[in-house]
Interface confidence: medium
């Protein structure tokens, strides 16, 4: 898609320093020492790709803004009127490195681009990769991509929320719910109806990818053997198999419970029953109370029997606007009796109650194993009339375009370096030339990363 720029731009000094350290560690050569210069150059795919765009041309060329209206929505909010721009990140440490930016908040956004050629799910893997930076953080919104199904009706300037997609992949967040979607649309071979299949949630904590304001690299790898991997920043955060790890499962169960089956009226599900032979003992007193007064208790010394717990407040005064005809006779509000504060208690003393040692309660026969117990009733199993078995879910609907159809409460979501390819090596090269450079410029490069990038650049000048 995007051709490479010939503009060569210096990266800021802090990255130069990192590179200088790497250069210093190389063996001396006879050439006179010179200050190494790291330059940003738009990445160029190192092999065949279905799609690649680094946006470093600075324009939206090749991308189509949707003119569609969102279905089932009031006219004033139905339009895809969210703005898109191609520009550098606000805090960019790589001048000249541009990306696609979702500019507006609380608006519907839709933009898409045609692939160089449709992707057919045959014998090669599918690899989809792109970068996202939530420059203002993210309150509620998505940054996922849709791979739009190749259909005769596909019309990119009418791209909307109901446009058929084959795969949806990428980050999404609302409130404290942090998601990394991988959904594919599977066609039920019996009914012809498409059903969304969702990958299980990653075990990894995704929160930092949304909150740290760094650029993160999202990769989806789908293999012809139905296995998949999802990576963030080149580390696997989720993996599985399309047959075993999607919800709902691709293939329904062979058998289902018979919806017509009914539990027989005489079916006994009670594991225990009262012993029918048991008899209440003669000395069992069902009327004895659970609690009785403690006859051992004595009134504490200094108890003030004649003092009330509460007394009228002597400092209270009748309000001036008190009308006895309307409000009745005025009474001072009650306060805790100050004389009781130094005494163990005031008022009539009552014995505390204790558990009755002779309390037995209502007699019940003991429980015994039910000799007629039949177990918990379950409906019988019958062959599932909707059963089918698709052992090759990887063979999905071909797709011929990539689209971003998003709503966000936060603006300035930065996307960059989209690539769709069938070769992991090409995708990794692209990542090193794009995201790897950003990572290094952020000062977050692990030891050796910059050195590897320099070596890679020397191998592929």
């Amino acid at each position: 898609h995007d051709g490479h720029d010939d503009d060569v731009i210096d990266i800021e000094d802090d990255l130069d320093d990192v590179i200088e350290e790497v250069e210093d560690s190389k063996p001396d050569t006879t050439a006179p020492p010179s200050s190494p210069k790291v330059t940003y150059k738009a990445p160029v795919p190192t092999g065949e790709v279905y799609f690649a765009d680094s946006f470093d041309r600075g324009t939206l060329s090749g991308w189509i803004l949707s003119k569609a209206k969102k279905d089932d929505t009031d006219d004033e909010i139905a339009k895809y009127d969210g703005k898109w721009e191609v520009e550098e990140m606000k805090e960019s440490k790589l001048p000249g490195d541009k990306g696609l930016v979702l500019m507006s908040r609380a608006k519907h956004h839709a933009i898409s681009a045609k692939l160089n050629k449709p992707f057919l799910f045959d014998t090669k893997p599918l690899i989809v990769q792109y970068e996202v930076n939530f420059q203002n953080g993210i309150e509620c919104g998505g940054a996922y991509v849709k791979l739009l199904s190749k259909t005769p009706e596909l019309n990119l300037d009418q791209f909307h929320d109901k446009t058929p997609y084959t795969i949806m992949f990428g980050p999404d967040k609302c409130g404290e719910d942090y998601k990394l979607h991988f959904i594919f649309r599977h066609k039920n071979p019996k009914t012809g109806i498409y059903e969304e299949k969702h990958a299980k949630r990653p075990d990894a904590d995704l929160k930092t990818y949304f909150t740290d304001k760094k650029t993160h690299l999202y990769t989806l790898i789908l293999n012809p053997d139905n296995s998949f991997e999802i990576l963030v920043d080149q580390s696997v955060v989720n993996s599985g198999n399309l047959l075993n790890d999607m919800t709902p499962p691709v293939n329904p169960s062979r058998e289902i419970e018979d919806p017509e089956d009914r539990k027989p009226e005489d079916w006994d599900e009670r594991p225990k029953i009262p012993d029918p032979e048991a008899v209440k003992p003669d000395d069992w007193d069902e009327d004895a109370p659970a609690k009785i007064p403690d006859e051992e208790a004595t009134k504490p010394e200094g108890w003030l029997d004649d003092e009330p717990e509460y007394v009228p407040d002597p400092d209270a005064e009748k309000p001036e606007d008190w009308d006895e005809d309307m409000d009745g006779e005025w009474e001072a509000p009650q306060i805790a009796n100050p004389r009781c504060e130094s005494a163990p208690g005031c008022g009539v003393w009552q014995r505390p109650v204790i558990d009755n040692p002779n309390y037995k309660g209502k007699w019940k026969p003991p429980m015994i194993d039910n000799p007629s117990y039949q177990g918990i009733w379950k409906p019988r199993k019958i062959p599932n009339p909707d059963f089918f078995e698709d052992l090759e879910p990887f063979r999905m609907t071909p797709f011929s375009a990539i689209g971003l159809e998003l709503w966000s409460m936060t603006s300035d979501i930065f996307f960059d370096n989209f690539i769709i390819c069938a070769d992991r090596r090409i995708v990794d090269d692209w990542a090193n030339d794009g995201w790897g450079l950003k990572k290094a410029a952020d000062g977050a490069a692990e030891p050796g990363v910059v050195g590897q990038m320099i070596e890679a650049a020397e191998e592929r000048p």
């Epitope: 050629k117 449709p118 057919l120 045959d122 199904s149 190749k150 259909t151 005769p152 009706e153 599977h186 066609k187 039920n188 071979p189 019996k190 009914t191 012809g192 109806i193 498409y194 089918f388 698709d390 063979r395 999905m396 609907t397 071909p398």
Partner: antibody
Framework: EVQLVQSGAEVKKPGASVKVSCKAS????????MHWVRQAPGQRLEWMGW????????KYSQKFQGRVTITRDTSASTAYMELSSLRSEDTAVYYC??????????????????WGQGTTVTVSS | QSVLTQPPSASGTPGQRVTISCSGS????????VYWYQQLPGTAPKLLIY???QRPSGVPDRFSGSKSGTSASLALSGLRSEDEADYYC???????????FGGGTKLTVL
């Protein structure tokens, strides 16, 4: 048993129209698209178009656009292909065909596993 | 003139392996799936291969399909007399916005 049964042979004069029917049985008619393919004597197969039996959407081959109309009657589980302004080169066997049931991607035609027996249309003055 | 090009004829003896080719362009085979049909005289075509290399149930594994770039091929191994028929390749064509068939290859079992 899944089958498609087509109407009988037709003889038409140039300029006339012909309407061929295709009755489906043994499956849910509205869950599949129905395609029409013809074959002139000794010639290759030629795709004419399809109808989504569920929603009635149609797509026609550029070659037949304007002359062919494909319709369906869901209550009768029947698809129809009407070809107008007939000429002698339209003499052919006309087939209706349904997409392979395990192929999820039926919106992109190609894999037809169930075919009608064919209807011979002869255009002659 | 067919958009997909097949050799008009092919032949082999029983037990032999025969390959039929189908040549197209980037707008059809290059970006779409390939299908293969067998047509016995006076009958409707029968689907042999779909999605380039998949066999519907009931089609023997003597039939296999493959695709590379803008060409596809159908291979028949262990040739039998009942394999004598016309064989057609097909693919969707993006520029014509329609399904196109090859001209057909007549296979003779000697």
């Amino acid at each position: 048993e899944v089958q498609l049964v087509q109407s009988g042979a037709e003889v038409k004069k140039p300029g006339a129209s012909v309407k061929v029917s295709c009755k489906a049985s043994g499956y849910t008619f509205t869950s599949y698209a129905m395609h029409w393919v013809r074959q002139a004597p000794g010639q290759r197969l030629e795709w004419m178009g399809w109808i989504n039996a569920g929603n009635g959407n149609t797509k026609y081959s550029q070659k037949f656009q304007g002359r062919v109309t494909i319709t369906r009657d869901t209550s009768a589980s029947t698809a129809y292909m009407e070809l107008s302004s007939l000429r002698s080169e339209d003499t052919a066997v006309y087939y209706c065909a349904r997409v392979l049931h395990v192929l999820r991607y039926f919106d992109w035609p190609g894999a037809f596993d169930i075919w009608g027996q064919g209807t011979t249309v002869t255009v002659s003055s | 003139q067919s958009v997909l090009t097949q050799p008009p004829s092919a032949s082999g003896t029983p037990g032999q392996r025969v390959t039929i080719s189908c040549s197209g362009s980037s707008s059809n085979i290059g970006t779409n799936y390939v299908y293969w049909y067998q047509q016995l005289p006076g009958t409707a075509p029968k689907l042999l291969i779909y999605i380039n290399d998949q066999r519907p149930s009931g089609v023997p594994d003597r039939f296999s399909g493959s695709k590379s770039g803008t060409s596809a091929s159908l291979a028949l191994s262990g040739l039998r007399s009942e394999d004598e028929a016309d064989y057609y390749c097909a693919a969707w064509d993006d520029s014509l916005s329609g399904l196109v068939f090859g001209g057909g290859t007549k296979l003779t079992v000697l």
